[in-house]
Amino acid sequence: SAPFSFLSNVKYNFMRIIKYEFILNDALNQSIIRANDQYLTAAALHNLDEAVKFDMGAYKSSKDDAKITVILRISKTQLYVTAQDEDQPVLLKEMPEIPKTITGSETNLLFFWETHGTKNYFTSVAHPNLFIATKQDYWVCLAGGPPSITDFQILENQA
């Protein structure tokens, strides 16, 4: 099959929530926090209660996915992490419920999740060479790599 690319005809179906209420810490041990209603940022926290808690939902397509495809939702909300373009902040998009199917331009809600030991990476399904990343004095954004930080530790059972 073809390498990952933005394919509007691929339909992704929601399967289940695979992780609940976890925190994402970057390689500088900064936690992702809410910057405002629309954006996220990263900060070193003494109290992890201030960190955003995420849920991770798994999707599958009909094309034999090569990687696990996920959606990221802020726990206990209807806000979903949404990719824009390179070096643009990811947005928080409000939706009444988790999408049962995702296709076309809505694939900016989906990410390929990779694990490498304790490090986790989220590449955009809409932009497969771009990662969810933190950047000094900036919002959480999409980036191709350094100087942005693209690897995250998942901290579970923080509730």
Partner: antibody
Framework: QVQLQQPGAELVRPGASVKLSCKAS????????MNWVKQRPEQGLEWIGR????????LYSQKFKDTAILTVDKSSSTAYMQLSSLTSEDSAVYYC???????WGQGTTLTVSS | QIVLTQSPALMSASPGEKVTMTCSAS?????MYWYQQKPRSSPKPWIY???NLASGVPARFSGSGSGTSYSLTISSMEAEDAATYYC?????????FGGGTKLEMK
């Protein structure tokens, strides 16, 4: 810590079947796909297929889709690979590897011999 | 399926020498992954997402490339680097491995 435990060796007769096991620990078994990889003596690595332990959905390499069957037992966090109609060509080391290929079992050496 | 061709199949290097091995893909892939294997041992993750070193991998190793051409480089060969290195893609199904480059110490 994540561990994938495999038996060290299996000896079987040509034409028979064998079920290799891979017991996972240290993580949530149903969250991560499990891969199986073959390595014949002095040769390279071949991906056999993968299974999603949550719903047992499988995907096989074309080469192995008629001879390998991947299953799981969620209650014991164990992945299995059954190989049937064995020949000497199936003599190899078989590895299980977690999604991401970041954790590998020690491998089971399968010897097919009469 | 995507075929990965590694070259050279066998190479030897002296201590301190710079070493480069390549992996060529039959179709473009977004990222390449590399594993180190020593005799009677499981493959170890070595480089992932083209250029990231796995935990515990010495900084003398590096990975680079894009599209159909990727490489693994050792800036200064050491005895413990003698092993077989495999490239792999899991950009598309089926996942595939290269045939390996066996690196020996001179």
């Amino acid at each position: 810590q994540v561990q994938l435990q495999q038996p060290g060796a299996e000896l079987v007769r040509p034409g028979a079947s064998v079920k290799l096991s891979c017991k996972a620990s240290g993580y949530t078994f149903t969250t991560y796909w499990m891969n199986w990889v073959k390595q014949r003596p002095e040769q390279g690595l071949e991906w056999i297929g993968r299974i999603d332990p949550y719903d047992s959905e499988t995907l096989y390499s074309q080469k192995f889709k008629d001879t390998a069957i991947l299953t799981v037992d969620k209650s014991s966090s164990t992945a299995y690979m059954q190989l049937s109609s064995l020949t000497s060509e199936d003599s190899a080391v078989y590895y299980c590897a977690r999604y991401g290929f970041d954790y590998w079992g020690q491998g089971t050496t399968l010897t097919v011999s009469s | 399926q995507i075929v990965l061709t590694q070259s050279p199949a066998l190479m030897s290097a002296s201590p301190g020498e710079k070493v480069t091995m390549t992996c060529s893909a039959s179709s473009s892939v977004n990222y390449m992954y590399w594993y180190q294997q020593k005799p009677r041992s499981s493959p170890k993750p070595w480089i992932y997402l083209t250029s990231n070193l796995a935990s515990g991998v010495p900084a003398r190793f590096s990975g680079s490339g894009s599209g159909t051409s990727y490489s693994l480089t050792i800036s200064s060969m050491e005895a413990e680097d003698a092993a077989t290195y495999y490239c792999q893609q899991w950009n598309s199904n089926p996942y595939t491995f290269g045939g390996g480059t066996k690196l020996e110490m001179k």
